[in-house]
Interface confidence: low
């Protein structure tokens, strides 16, 4: 057994540039030739245990064989030189690992950052992958002094081991080196103070002002290298539920500061704030954002009164009536605070008044048949809204003036209502709506619109294929005008069932068919027309179309003594639905006729 290898491969540590050619040689020792009775022609080259084709191999002399590879692309190849001893037994002589890759690119985009409280970190773009072990060294020096090299672990960044010295320029560059070459980046020259990224401001607090409901005061603590740097700020805020931030103009926060008053905010609204800082010259990097802090602006009196309406309940007799005053809770944007209660004042025409404090959104009062004026104001802890005023006329007064050209139509999944105003100046409009049903009472919802509005959409949660009865009432200073109503659908569908047809009268050659209107709950839309299909057991089917206003129809030119099958369908704008089939037989003779 030979302890010494039988030969060697040269080069022993081959590194090849990808895409280039490469030649290796295997030199056998003289002792080996004699021991195994071989020469170089017995050499078998293998890559990753697979024999290399003969055409790539050249026998140079009795001890030496070469192998040539063109366009090397594999990152790593096990190359072995083997001999066929005694003509058949394969014996390994020597093996090497052949690596391929690229020389390093010149590093680019070299940038450095000094995170406050940490050493300087520099980053660069190393360029294309080398596929080889490549060392990246960050070098830095003053004009007169070199700093310790920084050996990069990842090849794209390095944090220097020394603390930065501010207000003195430093030169920094990167050297990249591997088995195929060595290259340096362009150097950059800067003062580390201009590369500082401050730590985020902290202890951000938000306070409101009782005097001004539109402001919030911010205060915070800045670091800035322990006061070494003057910092300017960037302040952003949003309402609690919003996803987008509002920017305080940067020119307002350019000077170094640790407090700021944000203006033009909405009353009684929660805002979330965040702040970051940078060197006041604008050089360096913005800090990360501070932790968010929130605050709520102070309440302001409600900006408008609630929508206000009333309904007269069935009369208790001649002496008095029960009136239910109803109103809508103000949206937050108008309430400007927590509504504590509502103040309702009812004034009789003789100047007798009664004040009620109500926490809910309705109040039922008993009134005589005189005219009353009702006023309603919403109250929060700052004050009261302006009053909404309603005149409740005597029940003996007939309402005059109503809207004209009332229309309703669906659009964009909303039910729109439009009208032409009456000729007399209006204070506001009340829209009321409910689902028409034979199975349940018409439970009304309502909304109020300003006097300038003559087109709006219903703001309730409407259901498809339900018939809505919509009423529009103009309200004047003297009280409500006349009400106009119509029916509308948010979205129609085909009817749930078709009509059930029956015969009202059957003659020898004609039959009067009758049917009931489909209940409104099953209509699912406006019934536009009916179709009547009729046939005999052997005859062709006949179809007649009937207007939706009819509930009977006479079939004529029928054959006597014949069984007829009849079916009706009802159609909305969205399709039709058949009713059940019905059969009848015409008599053989007309009344009074004999054979």
């Amino acid at each position: 057994q030979l302890l010494e290898p039988c030969g060697y491969i040269y080069p022993e540590f081959p590194v090849v540039q990808r895409g280039s050619n490469f030649t290796a040689i295997c030199v056998l020792k003289e002792a080996c030739l004699q021991h195994y009775y071989v020469n170089a022609s017995y050499i078998v080259w293998k890559t990753n245990h697979a024999a290399v084709p003969r055409e790539q191999v050249t026998v140079i002399n009795r001890t030496t064989s070469s192998v040539t590879f063109t366009d090397v692309v594999l990152p790593s190849v096990q190359l072995t030189c083997n001999i066929l001893s005694f003509g058949q037994i394969e014996q390994n002589v020597y093996g090497v690992t052949m690596l391929s890759g690229f020389p390093p690119d010149k590093p680019t985009n070299l940038t450095c950052i000094v995170n406050e409280g940490k050493n300087m970190l520099c980053q660069w773009d190393p360029g294309r992958e080398t596929y080889l072990e490549t060392n990246y060294t960050l070098k830095s020096e003053w004009a007169t002094e070199k700093f310790p090299d920084c050996q990069s672990k990842h090849g794209t960044s390095c944090m220097v081991s020394y603390m930065p010295t501010y207000y003195v320029n430093i030169e920094v560059w990167v050297e990249a080196e591997n088995a195929l070459g060595k290259v340096s980046s362009e150097s950059i020259n800067f003062d580390p103070v201009d590369k500082v990224k401050p730590t985020p401001p902290y202890n951000l607090s938000v306070t409101n002002s009782e005097e001004l409901s539109s402001i919030l005061k911010l205060s915070w603590v800045s670091s800035g290298l322990g006061g070494l740097l003057d910092l300017k700020s960037d302040i952003q805020y949003r309402t609690k539920d919003a996803s987008t931030w509002i920017q305080v103009p940067l020119e307002d926060t350019m000077s170094p500061r640790t407090s700021f008053t944000v203006q033009d905010l909405k009353p009684f609204t929660e805002y979330v704030f965040r702040i970051r800082s940078i060197k006041d010259s604008g050089k360096g990097y913005w800090s990360d954002w501070s932790e968010e802090a929130s605050g709520t602006t102070y309440e302001d009196r409600p900006s408008r009164p609630p929508s206000f309406w009333y309904k007269t309940n069935p009369s208790h007799g001649q002496e008095y009536r029960s009136v239910r005053l109803i109103w809508k809770a103000l949206p937050l944007s108008e309430a400007n605070g927590k509504i504590l209660d509502y103040e309702v004042i009812l004034t009789q025409s003789k100047s007798v008044s009664q004040t009620y404090t109500v926490t809910g959104t309705e109040l039922t009062v008993n009134l005589t048949n005189d005219r009353y004026v009702a006023s309603l104001a919403a109250r929060n802890k700052v004050g009261k809204s302006a009053a909404a005023v309603l005149t409740i006329p005597s029940p003996h007064v007939t309402a005059a003036y109503s809207v004209v050209n009332l229309k309703a139509f669906p659009k964009d999944n909303l039910l729109w209502v439009e009208w032409t105003p009456p000729p007399k100046p209006v204070s506001k409009y009340i829209l009321e709506w409910c689902v028409l049903s034979e199975n349940a009472p018409c439970v009304e919802d309502w909304q109020q619109e300003d006097a300038t509005v003559n087109r709006t959409h219903l703001r309730g949660r409407l259901l498809e294929s339900k018939c809505y009865q919509i009423t529009v009432t103009p309200v004047f200073a003297t009280g409500p005008g006349g009400s106009e109503s119509l029916k509308a659908y948010l979205k129609q569908a085909a009817p749930a069932r078709g009509p059930t047809v029956r015969t009202k009268k059957v003659g020898k050659n004609e039959a009067v068919l009758a049917w009931d209107q489909i209940p409104v709950d099953d209509q699912n839309g406006f019934i536009r027309n009916y179709s009547i299909s009729y046939r005999t057991s052997v005859g062709k089917e006949m179809v007649v179309h009937v207007d939706s206003s009819h509930t009977e129809y006479t079939l004529s030119s029928l054959s006597s003594d014949t069984l007829y099958m009849v079916r009706m369908a009802a159609y909305t704008d969205e399709g039709g639905k058949d009713g059940p089939e019905f059969t009848f037989t015409t008599p053989k003779f007309a009344q009074g006729e004999i054979e």
Epitope: T359, G360, T361, E362
Partner: nanobody, 125 residues
């Protein structure tokens, strides 16, 4: 999963007191108002009292006004019914109910979507 769990029922002598509790859980959004109902065997379930979970405003059935008080502890997600001066006719199964209908607080049974299993109150002479 929405759950309402009543507790605190039991037997008491006329003129006595009981305090019912109702724990609520599983709501994505809290109910608009919570109510207490009672049912005597063979009779319709009737509204006793209700409280708005937002403003705390409440309504009562005439038969319990001045004797019963409904309250809530938002932090514990619990609604209570304090019953004083109990009468024989207050006997029945008491149910806690929750409504998500956005309307004024009410003891209208039809406005309630979620119901508890009930707790028995028995008033004896």
């Amino acid at each position: 999963q929405v759950q309402l769990q009543e507790s605190g029922g039991g037997s008491v002598q006329a003129g006595g007191s009981l305090r019912l509790s109702c724990g609520i859980s599983g709501f994505t959004y809290r109910p608009t108002f919570m109510g207490w109902f009672r049912q005597v065997l063979g009779k319709e379930r009737e509204g006793v009292a209700a409280i708005s979970t937002g403003g705390g405003s409440s309504v009562y059935a005439d038969s319990v006004k001045g004797r019963f008080t409904v309250s809530q502890d938002s932090s514990k997600n619990t609604v209570y019914l304090e019953m004083n001066g109990l009468k024989l006719e207050d006997t029945g199964m008491y149910y806690c109910a929750a409504s998500t209908v956005i309307t004024s607080v009410s003891i209208n049974r039809g406005l309630y979507q979620y119901w508890g299993q009930g707790t028995q109150v028995t008033v004896s002479s």
